[in-house]
Interface confidence: low
């Protein structure tokens, strides 16, 4: 789901931003400003900030203060500068509920002037309200406790879809607001381990009855966790073909630090796993490759404006880092090696992750170390090479005339299972080999077009390779011609 854009007629205000969730910036721009006070582990946490999305503010600002938190909202430049939210003192009725019941009372009075009825409603509602707040303040988890922070009232009653739909981070990121991220993370129950590797583990978890994926990084891959966290929290990355980020957290568990990245859960697993078990028809094959191309094009492009994003190159694109969704599309995962580029400042942010990409998918210029490391386009071209290999993996599993190839990884016939840098360099740079295109592909128009496309991703000269946008357009064209063919029949 794309993040909701501010309504055109909504005025934006400058707000004071205080608290560690402000991304080290002391102001922010939004449709409403807020000042909040919440109890965190028994201590008062004051925060100020803004809501970029009007609905988010509406939802939060209407929440009456409780013993656990209070939020005061306002509209106007710097209007929250001198506002300090106050927790209600015991015994006092809450202003929020007073106003609410006053409105209700007037409506009832106008209909059936029953003042006593209003008193009854007030009594019952306040009793219910008190009880609900007591329940909410009970620790949810003995080991961690629940961090009661801004908007967590709504977290308890919202689905992830709703939260992400109306999310506004204090930066321009694509996840939940910072305070909510930690709350969500601490409310997750790990159910089953669905993947293990050098990176750590992936678990299926449950949050409020919804499935989420929890990637638990090994301590040696801490920089990948930091990089993904940094990226998702500073770049607007919400796109149907990029794995949906929910939250990131660092916890001390069993006396060791655990690094969690929480994302949407896709039960079909990775494209790598999916291709082992499934053969594809033309439609599903094109849906897969077009969705990957769309995700990659979104990563590669820089979008300007308030809802913009830096250009990003993935640097570890492979079938294991692509997930299959229920609708047959895919989404790109694992941004732990990603590089960012901003045209306006001409800044290239390579990060400092010692991890390197997967050798099997490395482009010739990476293998022979001729890559221009200070040029962002170089990294995009590396992604295109890898995309071509993924395209080949997928195309092999597309049935034509009743024939299909077994799933095999790229270069399966010329390098060992865990190829070394030198193995790959010899095959790709010295011998300039490319994955074999089976003859049967040329008797199918779609596979013929895909073969041509992948070859244009595999040029030895990086600058000759296609761009992600061109690939996306070509695949869309192939897809459309298939539709036309179907309607003509």
């Amino acid at each position: 789901v794309e993040d909701e854009k501010p309504k055109v007629n909504q005025k934006l205000y400058m707000c004071v931003c205080e608290g560690l969730s402000c991304g080290n910036e002391d102001h922010c721009e939004g449709q409403q400003c807020f000042s909040s006070l919440s109890i965190n582990d028994g201590f008062h946490v004051y925060q100020k900030g803004c809501f970029q999305v009007y609905e988010q503010g509406k939802m939060t600002c209407k929440t009456p203060p409780s013993p656990g938190q209070a939020v005061e909202c306002c509209q106007g430049d710097w209007c929250n500068r001198n506002i300090t939210a106050q927790l209600p003192t015991k015994g006092k009725s809450f202003p929020g509920t007073q106003n609410f019941h006053l409105e209700v009372g007037l409506i009832i009075l106008s209909v059936v002037f029953a003042v006593c009825l209003l008193a009854c409603i007030l009594g019952v509602a306040l009793r219910k309200f008190k009880r609900r707040n007591q329940e909410r303040l009970n620790p949810r988890d003995v080991e961690y406790g629940t961090i009661e922070g801004l908007i967590t009232t709504n977290v308890g009653d919202s689905t992830l879809a709703e939260l992400l739909d109306h999310s506004c981070t204090s930066g321009s990121g694509s996840g939940l607001p910072f305070l909510v991220q930690r709350t969500v993370a601490r409310q997750i129950t790990l159910l089953e381990c669905v993947g293990k590797g050098r990176y750590g583990e992936v678990w299926r978890g449950s949050w409020q009855g919804e499935n989420v994926a929890v990637k638990i990084f090994s301590s040696r891959d801490e920089k990948s966790w930091f990089r993904e966290t940094e990226l998702y929290n500073t770049v607007m990355l919400r796109h149907e073909n990029i794995l949906g980020f929910i939250a990131s957290d660092m916890t001390s568990r069993h006396s060791s630090t655990q690094l969690w990245l929480i994302t949407h859960y896709h039960e079909m697993g990775s494209l790598y796993d999916y291709l082992q078990l499934t053969t594809l028809d033309t439609v599903s094959c094109l849906r897969i490759v077009l969705s990957i191309a769309s995700g990659l094009a979104h990563l590669h492009i820089e979008i300007f404006g308030t809802q913009g994003k830096s250009a990003i190159a993935h640097r570890d694109l492979k079938s294991k880092n692509i997930l299959v969704k229920k609708n047959g599309q895919c989404c790109i995962a694992d941004l732990g090696l990603a590089v960012m580029h901003s045209q306006s400042t001409n800044q290239l942010d390579v990060g400092n992750n010692p991890r390197v990409g997967t050798k099997r998918y490395m482009a010739p210029e990476v293998l022979d170390e001729t890559i221009q490391v200070d040029c962002f386009d170089s990294y995009k071209r590396v992604d295109i090479w890898a995309f071509g290999l993924v395209l080949w993996e997928v195309a092999r599993r597309m049935v034509s005339n009743g024939i299909v190839e077994d799933y095999k990884p790229p270069f399966y016939d010329v390098v060992p299972n865990d190829p070394s840098f030198e193995d790959m360099r010899k095959v790709v740079c010295v011998d300039q080999q490319r994955p074999n295109i089976p003859n049967r592909w040329f008797s199918d128009p779609t596979l013929t077009s895909l073969a041509k496309l992948m070859k244009e991703c595999w040029y030895q000269n990086p600058s000759a390779r296609l761009t992600a946008l061109r690939i996306k357009k070509t695949l869309t064209k192939i897809d459309n011609s298939l539709d036309k063919l179907k309607t003509d029949c």
């Epitope: 560690l20 201590f43 946490v45 204090s170 910072f178 930690r182 930091f226 901003s342």
Partner: antibody
């Protein structure tokens, strides 16, 4: 993550000026709030100044207010500290530090190795 | 402005000994951050959010506290733990005040 290297330190006479620089690499500099922290010989750490990501908000310790100016050039990945009217008590090892706010109530801090400023006649 | 007072100023511990360093705030704070600084090196983030160990910090370290009283503990002192430890309270706005530090030595 960001790596930081300070430069510009040296021996200077009281009342004179000096400009320190801190070059950042390895990450997008503009994502980080920056600060200068100093440590007098054999003493503890003292926060000197802070600057927000886009230079909108700048803060100084009372001991340097009016004499020191913190600034940054995001295009050059560089943080500066212009020091004027230097005093002997400004003698210290000056560290630049970067802070990124992650999704919890605390900072990740990255520090440079420091540059020595000696104010003496 | 919150003042942080660390105690003791200096302490020596034998290998294997349990060590506790204290940090007292002049008024109640929400959480505490600790830094380790070895001789001739830059300070390193050691404990954040009162009790969370920074990456690479051995599990023998722990942090605790609330209100005005915070502490850093080492369950079993090792030679590599010799350093000066500073506490810091990060507020929304500066000034940021560090404690004066506790120098931990090996007996």
């Amino acid at each position: 993550e960001v790596q930081l290297v300070e430069s510009g330190g040296g021996l200077v006479q009281p009342g004179r000026s000096l400009k320190l620089s801190c070059l950042a690499s390895g990450s997008t500099f503009s994502n980080y709030g920056m600060k200068w922290i100093r440590q007098a010989p054999g003493k503890g750490l003292e926060w000197v100044a802070s600057i927000s990501r886009s230079s909108t908000y700048i803060y100084y310790a009372d001991t340097v207010k009016g004499r020191f100016t913190i600034s940054r050039d995001n295009a050059r990945n560089t943080l500066y500290l212009q020091m004027t009217s230097l005093r002997s008590e400004d003698t210290a090892l000056y560290y630049c530090a970067a802070a990124i706010s992650t999704p919890f109530y605390w900072y990740f801090d990255f520090w440079g190795p420091g540059t020595v400023v000696t104010v003496s006649s | 402005e919150i003042v942080l007072t660390q105690s003791p100023t200096t302490m020596a511990a034998s290998p294997g000994e349990k060590v506790t360093l204290n940090c007292l705030a002049s008024s109640s704070v929400s959480y505490m951050t600790w830094y380790q600084q070895k001789s001739g090196a830059s300070p390193k983030l050691w404990i954040y959010g009162t009790s969370n160990l920074a990456s690479g910090v051995p599990n023998r370290f722990s942090g605790s506290g609330s209100g005005t009283s915070y502490s850093l503990a080492i369950s079993s002192m090792e030679a590599e733990d010799v350093a000066t430890y500073y506490c810091l309270h990060l507020t929304s706005y500066p000034p940021y005040t560090f404690g004066a530090g506790t120098k931990l030595e090996l007996k």
